[in-house]
Interface confidence: low
């Protein structure tokens, strides 16, 4: 019979022969022959292969280096890589999450629009009229100015985007 030019899924062509690929979590030790099956071996404890393959070496699990602010989010298996994420208060610098940076704080006059996550930084917004923020924070939103009227007081000093209004007693007309 004619030697095959293409093989089925989960097979590969070698020496004019279709051999079975190794399953995820295993590496190739020796190709099949006319008389023997493909020989595969499981990956070591700190290694993985996530596809049907003919690799002779497994990949090393990713190292979540605490010196870069990283920690293990999900430990790797023989079929999956380790997934890293950032420590509390930090976020990844890239989609691959190879290192972390400290969450940005919103300066006075700005409030937090969206709190940072392990993969995204803090989003700040300027405090609109009627709101203020007097702190640098990665969590605090803009606060509304105090309503002097509801306290039977009057505005003695107008608020800004960085300061609250100052309320004071109403001037009473003397008899």
């Amino acid at each position: 019979p004619e030697p095959p030019t293409a093989c089925r899924e989960k097979q590969y062509l070698i020496n004019s022969q279709c051999c079975s690929l190794c399953q995820p979590g295993q590496k190739l030790v020796s190709d099949c022959t006319e008389f023997t099956e493909t020989e595969c071996l499981p990956c070591g404890e700190s290694e993985f292969l996530d596809t049907w393959n003919r690799e002779t070496h497994c990949h090393q699990h990713k190292y979540c280096d605490p010196n870069l602010g990283l920690r293990v989010q999900q430990k790797g298996t023989s079929e999956t890589d380790t997934i890293c994420t950032c420590e509390e208060g930090w976020h990844c610098t890239s989609e691959a999450c190879e290192s972390c940076v400290l969450h940005r704080s919103c300066s006075p006059g700005f409030g937090v629009k969206q709190i940072a996550t392990g993969v995204s930084d803090t989003i700040c917004e300027p405090c609109p009229v009627g709101f203020f923020s007097n702190v640098s924070s990665a969590f605090e939103k803009c606060h509304p100015w105090t309503s002097c009227e509801t306290k039977d007081l009057v505005v003695q000093q107008a608020g800004t985007n960085k300061t609250d209004v100052v309320c004071g007693p109403q001037d009473r007309l003397r008899a």
């Epitope: 404890e45 700190s46 090393q60 699990h61 190292y63 605490p66 010196n67 920690r71 430990k75």
Partner: antibody, heavy 121, light 106 residues
Framework: EVQLVESGGGLVQPGGSLRLSCAAS????????MSWVRQAPGRGLEWVST????????YYADSVKGRFTISRDNSKNTLYLHMNSLRAEDTAVYYC??????????????WGQGTTVTVSS | SYELTQPPSVSVSPGQTASITCSGD??????ACWYQQKPGQSPVLVIY???RRPSGIPERFSGSNSGNTATLTISGTQAMDEADYYC?????????FGGGTKLTVL
């Protein structure tokens, strides 16, 4: 042979200072994070501090934060622990330990013989 | 702060299997390692990354870690295995040790 040799321990009064050193040999010192771990008499192991391979990242146990400083001189293959405002509860054997490297996942694979620090008046 | 809990002592007869546990909240999500310390000596790493053995450590030492518990298993325990054993993990940029377990070989 991979070796860590600590020195600098001794008797010091409460409130005093001390500097411990750890001389490393037999491996590429600048490639590995290093740690200090202590053990009070009759007690278990207590982590003190860790420094990354370049010296740019440092970590401390809450019990020593603000009082102890870890540092390293990669040109001298030496790790240091500067201890200030010492207290009686700092009395212990202090071990220098090498972090296991890229795929050891936060384990200390080589330890020194330890140096004894006694804080007493 | 994160804590790791170990039994203070475990006893085993020579040739039997000894199991030492280490418990911590979601410890299985972290990598655990184990140290052996004999009286008057420095600690020695016996298991890292949950179940890996450094070179020179006998095959009778093995480890596992899932859920809230990491376990050090010593099969065919020998008199020379009598020592204190400590588990350790990284948690939020700090190293945490268990309180230690004294293994007595009867």
């Amino acid at each position: 042979e991979v070796q860590l040799v600590e020195s600098g321990g001794g008797l010091v009064q409460p409130g005093g200072s001390l500097r411990l050193s750890c001389a490393a040999s037999g491996f590429t010192f600048s490639s590995y994070a290093m740690s200090w771990v202590r053990q009070a008499p009759g007690r278990g192991l207590e982590w003190v501090s860790t420094i990354n391979n370049s010296g740019g990242g440092t970590y401390y146990a809450d019990s020593v934060k603000g009082r102890f400083t870890i540092s390293r001189d990669n040109s001298k293959n030496t790790l240091y622990l500067h201890m200030n405002s010492l207290r009686a509860e700092d009395t212990a054997v202090y071990y220098c330990a090498k972090e296991g490297g890229k795929y050891y996942y936060y384990a200390m694979d080589v330890w020194g013989q330890g140096t004894t620090v006694t804080v007493s008046s | 702060s994160y804590e790791l809990t170990q039994p203070p002592s475990v006893s085993v007869s020579p040739g039997q299997t000894a199991s030492i546990t280490c418990s911590g909240d979601k410890l299985g999500d972290k990598y655990a390692c184990w140290y052996q310390q004999k009286p008057g000596q420095s600690p020695v790493l016996v298991i890292y990354q949950d179940s890996r053995r450094p070179s020179g450590i006998p095959e009778r030492f093995s480890g596992s870690n899932s859920g809230n518990t990491a376990t050090l298993t010593i099969s065919g325990t020998q008199a020379m295995d009598e020592a204190d054993y400590y588990c350790q993990a990284w948690a939020s940029s700090t190293v945490v040790f268990g309180g230690g377990t004294k293994l007595t070989v009867l």
